[in-house]
């Protein structure tokens, strides 16, 4: 299922870095996140649990990321002009079943005031 | 899995408007392909088999399309700006098992020689 | 087609050692935690332990008491259970499984460990 | 450690008949809206295979005869019209907590 744009704040921008929130339904217990830039991925988060209900967090394209039970966060630092294009969360639901992927994203505008190292 | 820029010429112009190929491995017997423009479905195919071996073609979002072995082509007509976005072939493997999405893209230029309507 | 293949058991004598190999096919076997679980000639299912995707993290039953050891090599798609200092009560069918995100949803056949003088 | 029990230990059938197993755990398996329990068949000589998990959803490729049901500290499984290939062990399997353990089982065998 894609969901298309998301319908809330993707973009949080703070000290010349921007934090891209990837939100996904509480009721996700075990999923994997990516963050893709265009159709590369430049970042991901996968939460499973084991046969005891422990759980494991894993990354294989690390980024500084913050987990809620809602969200992920990734954080993206020393904007530049580059940084601008489509960003999406690729989010893959293991559970509850069945399995299923959502696609959201938003195109991420850079302005002057958002970069890191203005000239002044 | 995200493969990320597709590694073949993705989009062929014709008359004004334009073939968006979005190629699969020949081995996939039953699949969903769908072309999302940013994060948005634009059109769908779904090829699966029954019991008795009958194939079924279906779409939910309609486009013209045409099926290969190994490639859906989706096809624009009157191509104006508006088309100039990131298209992405989002393929939904589901036989041969395992399960696997794979998501390959690029970005469609429009210039103006490929418009439609060109205001001589 | 998910396939799970136990070698490795045989006879060992109280206090030896044994390791149990698992080798996987037909799936992405780094995307899975591993389980061992057991069956005592004429009982019941038993768990072992288990091991988190990468391997960096390993829990186990209280029986095992640090005497048992779970490991993989994902680019082998291998899961192993190193045993020392058997017991007799360890004589059992051990089995290999996938926790398949809810439940056990594919095994190996079994291997079989008997430890006797 | 959940303790799981199950009741009968073993029980006699008959083809078309309806079987019904149940299992307790010793604390409440509920987490959010779901039962983290599992049920298993095995068959003589042969390792076990998964038929329900959640206490309520049937495995991929599972018979519809097979039910699961129960919430809370009591589940059970039904078998709506058993048939002889349905004979062998099953056991319940918690998965709420580390250990994750399983009970006793119950033999269904021919009348």
């Known amino acids: 299922e894609i969901n298309g744009s998301a319908n809330y704040e993707m973009f949080i921008f703070h000290n010349g870095g921007v934090q891209i929130l990837c939100k996904y339904p509480d009721i996700v217990q075990q999923f994997k996140m990516q963050l893709l830039k265009g159709g590369q991925i430049l970042c991901d988060l996968t939460k499973t649990k084991g046969s005891g209900n422990k759980v494991s967090i894993k990354s294989l394209k690390f980024c500084h990321s913050q987990l809620s039970n809602n969200s992920v966060s990734f954080f993206l630092y020393n904007l530049d002009r580059s940084h601008a294009n489509y960003y999406f969360c690729n989010l893959s639901i293991f559970d509850p079943p069945p399995f299923k992927v959502t696609l959201t994203g938003g195109y991420l505008h850079i302005y002057e005031s958002q970069l890191c190292c203005q000239l002044k | 899995e995200i493969n990320g820029s597709a590694n073949y010429e993705m989009f062929i112009f014709h008359n004004g408007g334009v073939q968006i190929l979005c190629k699969y491995p020949d081995i996939v017997q039953q699949f969903k392909m769908q072309l999302l423009k940013g994060g948005q479905i634009l059109c769908d195919l779904t090829k699966t088999k029954g019991s008795g071996n009958k194939v079924s073609i279906k779409s939910l979002k309609f486009c013209h399309s045409q099926l290969s072995n190994n490639s859906v082509s989706f096809f624009l007509y009157n191509l104006d700006r508006s088309h100039a976005n990131y298209y992405f072939c989002n393929l939904s493997i589901f036989d041969p098992p395992p399960f696997k999405v794979t998501l390959t893209g690029g970005y469609l230029h429009i210039y103006e020689s490929q418009l439609c309507c060109q205001l001589k | 087609e998910v396939q799970l293949v136990e070698s490795g058991g045989g006879l060992v004598k109280p206090g030896g050692s044994l390791t149990l190999s698992c080798a996987a096919s037909?799936?992405?076997?780094?995307?899975?935690?591993m389980d061992w679980v057991r069956q005592g000639p004429g009982k019941g299912l038993e768990w072992v332990g288990n091991i988190d995707e990468d391997g960096s993290t390993t829990y186990y039953a209280p029986f095992v008491k640090g005497r048992f050891t779970i490991s993989r090599d994902n680019a082998k798609k291998t899961l192993y259970l190193q045993m020392n200092s058997v017991k007799s009560e360890d004589t059992a069918t051990y089995y290999c499984t996938r926790w398949g995100r809810y439940a056990f949803d594919s095994w190996g056949q079994g291997t079989l460990v008997t430890v006797s003088s | 450690d959940i303790v799981m029990t199950q009741s009968p230990s073993s029980l006699a059938v008959s083809p078309g008949d309806k079987v019904t197993i149940n299992c307790k755990s010793s604390?409440?398996?509920?987490?959010?809206?779901?039962?983290?329990l599992a049920w298993y068949q095995q068959k003589t000589g042969q390792a076990p295979k998964l038929l329900i998990f959640?206490?309520?959803t049937r495995h991929t490729g599972v018979p519809d005869r097979f039910m699961g049901s129960g919430s809370g500290t009591d589940f059970s499984l039904t078998i709506n019209s058993f048939q002889t290939e349905d004979l062998g062990d099953y056991y319940c399997?918690?998965?709420?907590?580390?250990?994750?353990?399983f009970g006793p089982g119950t033999k269904l065998e021919i009348k």
């Open positions: 604390q409440s398996l509920l987490s959010g809206n779901y039962n983290y």
């Open positions: 399997q918690h998965h709420y907590s580390t250990p994750p353990t």
């Open positions: 959640y206490a309520s």
């Open positions: 037909g799936f992405t076997f780094s995307d899975y935690w």
